[in-house]
């Protein structure tokens, strides 16, 4: 039975040209995390593997930095970065947990972070 929950940064906004940290946290489970995938819609951004470390997709190498922790930092944001991002936690023995973050990149200098929320 999967007992864990994913907490994410929820709906967030950031300024064009700026940077943002995408973070998810898996809680309420004793399962071991073996890998975390970060995806934008259907596009793989990065993989963090417990045995192999980080792999950043070549097309994002210059604009993505891993961390802090299992999070991901997006830099030099453009309006095209607006959209859904997913953290996919591969765990043993539970299986897969997925969290969703919606990022809006604003032209304006008024960009405020949304509240945290949980996905069971």
């Amino acid at each position: 039975m999967m007992t864990g929950t994913i907490e994410t940064t929820g709906n967030i906004s950031a300024e064009k040209g700026g940077s943002i940290i995408l973070q998810c946290h898996l809680s309420s489970t004793t399962a071991q995390v073996t890998q975390v995938n970060w995806e934008q819609q259907d596009q793989l951004l990065a993989i963090c593997n417990a045995d192999l470390g980080w792999h950043i997709s070549p097309s994002f190498k210059d604009r993505v930095a891993p961390g802090p922790g299992l999070g991901l930092t997006l830099q030099s944001l453009t309006v095209n970065d607006t959209g859904e991002y997913f953290c996919i936690y591969h765990t043993y023995p539970d299986g897969t947990y997925t969290g969703r973050i919606f990022l809006e990149v604003l032209e304006s200098s008024v960009a405020e972070h949304g509240a945290r929320f949980q996905i069971p």
């Epitope: 946290h25 004793t30 995390v33 963090c48 192999l52 470390g53 980080w54 891993p66």
Partner: antibody, heavy 117, light 107 residues
Framework: EVQLQQSGTVLARPGASVKMSCKAS????????MHWVKQRPGQGLEWIGA????????RYNQKFMGKAKLTAVTSASTAYMEISSLTNEDSSVYYC??????????WGQGTSVTVSS | DIVLTQSPATLSVTPGDSVSLSCRAS??????LHWYQQKSHESPRLLIK???QSISGIPSRFSGSGSGTDFTLSINSVETEDFGLYFC?????????FGGGTKLEIN
């Protein structure tokens, strides 16, 4: 086998600079952050900063901005830390450690720096 | 910066005792907390990752618990090789920070 081999003991004068190295082997150097941690004799651990050789991203503890400079040469799988304007407060053991998102799982043996006139 | 406060600073125990070491964060760090052991004249060693996840090669007598701001490292039936310094460290946000440490010594 993963190994982090650090350069040897350094004795330096106040005001001088030192550059120490951390040679990585046994894993993909560009897939892990390399952290640098300071430990004064008989004291705790203090995080200086980290470099991600995959794209040379760096993160610093504000306290060490301008004091420590982190670099990496991927072709040699080696990370470097340069400490400038040395004072007695910089006399410490400095550790490098790797982190791939799951804690700092391997550490170097430490480089001892003594600042003395 | 996130401040990690460890207590007690020193813990005197007898081999065979079970002990708990505390680490408290100045703000919520969810489960982004790791524990390290450092023996005299040695480099630190990772004991527990993400508050409670075990590390290959670390004896099962070491376990971790907690989330948010309060975390505990437990050692079930301390052995003589366990004496030394213990540090917690957060990876929730930059800059990473360490706690001040707990010294586990022989009573």
């Amino acid at each position: 086998e993963v190994q982090l081999q650090q350069s040897g003991t350094v004795l330096a004068r106040p005001g001088a600079s030192v550059k120490m190295s951390c040679k990585a082997s046994g894993y993909s150097f560009t897939s892990y952050w390399m952290h640098w941690v300071k430990q004064r004799p008989g004291q705790g651990l203090e995080w200086i900063g980290a470099i991600y050789p995959g794209n040379n991203a760096t993160r610093y503890n504000q306290k060490f901005m301008g004091k420590a400079k982190l670099t990496a040469v991927t072709s040699a799988s080696t990370a470097y830390m340069e400490i400038s304007s040395l004072t007695n407060e910089d006399s410490s053991v400095y550790y490098c450690s790797r982190e791939g998102g799951f804690g700092m799982d391997y550490w170097g043996q430490g480089t001892s720096v003594t600042v003395s006139s | 910066d996130i401040v990690l406060t460890q207590s007690p600073a020193t813990l005197s125990v007898t081999p065979g005792d079970s002990v708990s070491l505390s680490c408290r964060a100045s703000q919520s760090i969810t489960n982004n907390l790791h524990w390290y052991q450092q023996k005299s004249h040695e480099s630190p060693r990772l004991l527990i990752k993400y508050a409670s996840q075990s590390i290959s090669g670390i004896p099962s007598r070491f376990s971790g618990s907690g989330s948010g701001t309060d975390f505990t490292l437990s050692i079930n039936s301390v052995e003589t090789e366990d004496f030394g310094l213990y540090f917690c460290q957060q990876s929730n946000s930059w800059p990473y920070t360490f706690g001040g440490g707990t010294k586990l010594e022989i009573n």
